[in-house]
């Protein structure tokens, strides 16, 4: 009989472990944000992007913010922040202004309190993209380990957005928190 | 649809210049470059030079490179040829031409007659 | 600069037969496993029409009688059958490699 009683009780006990684990989980700021594709920059210099998906497609949000084009964080922390920016061209929409290109990609750090910017991840490559092939494909993904404060901003800036791949598998950014500051 | 609608023929004396226009409609004028090509009467094709409208990047054939400029306003969506120093030989139909979705030249202007006189 | 000899410079063909017009590059036009030689066609007082891009694909709105062939240095433009309204002056040009060129240009004359 004890020892039911003992496994009820330790099965009572797990439950709410799971229970408070889970919910200390969902508390757990993340975001992915996806390119929109209906407001991609024109040209070929270097640009903030500012139009993201925070709540469509693979695009989802939870306790941090995403405004101005920013991804704000709400809670301090350690984060993981990530890119995949993808450039693409085929001859069918347009013709290329040069052949030899710089694609960029800029994960920034922006901070309101102590007003600041760092680039905290940069990726790319020269690319020879010729005329008279008729596609062209380039991705680049950064990804880092970081320590944020709520109210720090993340964006991202590109070289040549009238190149970006504008799927949402394609070109993305996002962050999650991995552990709290001790 | 895509269309190139040039200015009129013009009638100069050598060593003038001459400035030609092309305004293009039905397309986004930036993302393809805009060619130049003339026709002397009863002779062949000649391809001048090009401009890639945007930041306004140019490529010429090398006979002409001293005298021509191509230049282009984004905002009337319009390319302009210059060709200084003109000679009775460079009296010809000048064409601006767009490549198709694909390759070749696809789209022509109507033409511009030139002719160099004294 | 790449120089493109079309021939011959004129030719007659009788109504329905077959008309065959040569081109041939200085120095290959094929890059990227793509032959970059289109053809033309001009009547008198108008702008030229591209026919043929590419070497060999039709371009929209032309008739199935025309057609074109070959490879790096050596094209073909083919009419088959040749129809009235053919009568003109047929170009080949290349654009692999800057500055583009045009060929001497074909006179076809129908019998």
């Known amino acids: 009989g004890s020892q039911h009683i003992r496994a009820e009780k330790a099965m009572v006990d797990g439950s709410w472990l799971d229970l408070a684990k889970r919910s200390k989980l969902e508390a757990q700021p993340f975001a992915h944000l996806t390119i929109n594709a209906t407001d991609i920059p024109s040209g070929s210099h270097k640009v903030s992007l500012s139009s993201w998906y925070h709540d469509r497609g693979w695009a989802k949000i939870s306790n941090m913010t995403f405004s101005n084009g920013k991804l704000i964080v709400n809670q301090d922390g350690f984060y993981y922040l990530y890119a995949n920016i993808c450039f693409r061209h085929h001859e069918t929409s347009g013709d290329l202004a040069t052949e030899y290109l710089q694609l960029m990609v800029y994960v920034t750090k922006t901070s309101i309190k102590i007003p600041s910017s760092h680039t905290l991840m940069k990726g790319g490559s020269t690319k020879y993209w010729s005329g008279n092939s008729e596609f062209h494909f380039y991705s680049i993904n950064v990804g880092g380990f970081f320590k944020l404060r709520s109210g720090e901003e993340i964006s991202i800036e590109v070289s040549n957005p009238s190149l970006l791949d504008p799927d949402q598998d394609a070109t993305y950014f996002g962050a999650f928190k991995v552990r709290d500051i001790d | 649809q895509v269309q190139l609608v040039q200015s009129g023929a013009e009638l100069k004396k050598p060593g003038a210049s001459v400035k030609l226009s092309c305004k293009a409609s039905?397309?986004?004028?930036?993302?393809?470059?805009l060619q130049w090509v003339r026709q002397a009467p009863g002779q062949g094709l000649e391809w001048m030079g090009a401009i890639y409208p945007g930041p306004g990047n140019t490529k010429y054939t090398q006979k002409f490179k001293d005298r021509f400029t191509i230049t282009a306003d984004t905002s009337k969506s319009t390319a302009y040829m210059q060709l200084n120093s003109l000679k009775s030989e460079d009296s010809a139909v000048y064409y601006c031409?767009?490549?198709?979705?694909?390759?070749?030249?696809?789209?022509w202007g109507q033409g511009t007659l030139v002719t160099v006189s004294a | 600069n790449i120089v493109l000899t079309q021939s011959p410079a004129s030719l007659a063909v009788s109504l329905g037969q077959r008309a065959t017009i040569s081109c041939r590059a200085s120095e290959s036009v094929d890059s990227y496993g793509r032959s970059f030689m289109h053809w033309y066609q001009q009547r008198p007082g108008q702008p030229p029409t591209l026919l043929i891009y590419l070497a060999s694909n039709l371009e929209s709105g032309v008739p199935v009688r025309f057609s074109g062939s070959g490879s790096r240095t050596d094209f073909t433009l083919t009419i088959d059958p040749v129809e009235a309204d053919d009568a003109a002056t047929y170009y080949c040009q290349q654009d692999n490699e800057d500055p583009y060129t045009f060929g001497g240009g074909t006179k076809l004359e129908i019998k």
């Open positions: 039905g397309y986004t004028f930036t993302t393809y470059w």
């Open positions: 031409a767009r490549r198709g979705s694909r390759r070749g030249i696809a789209y």
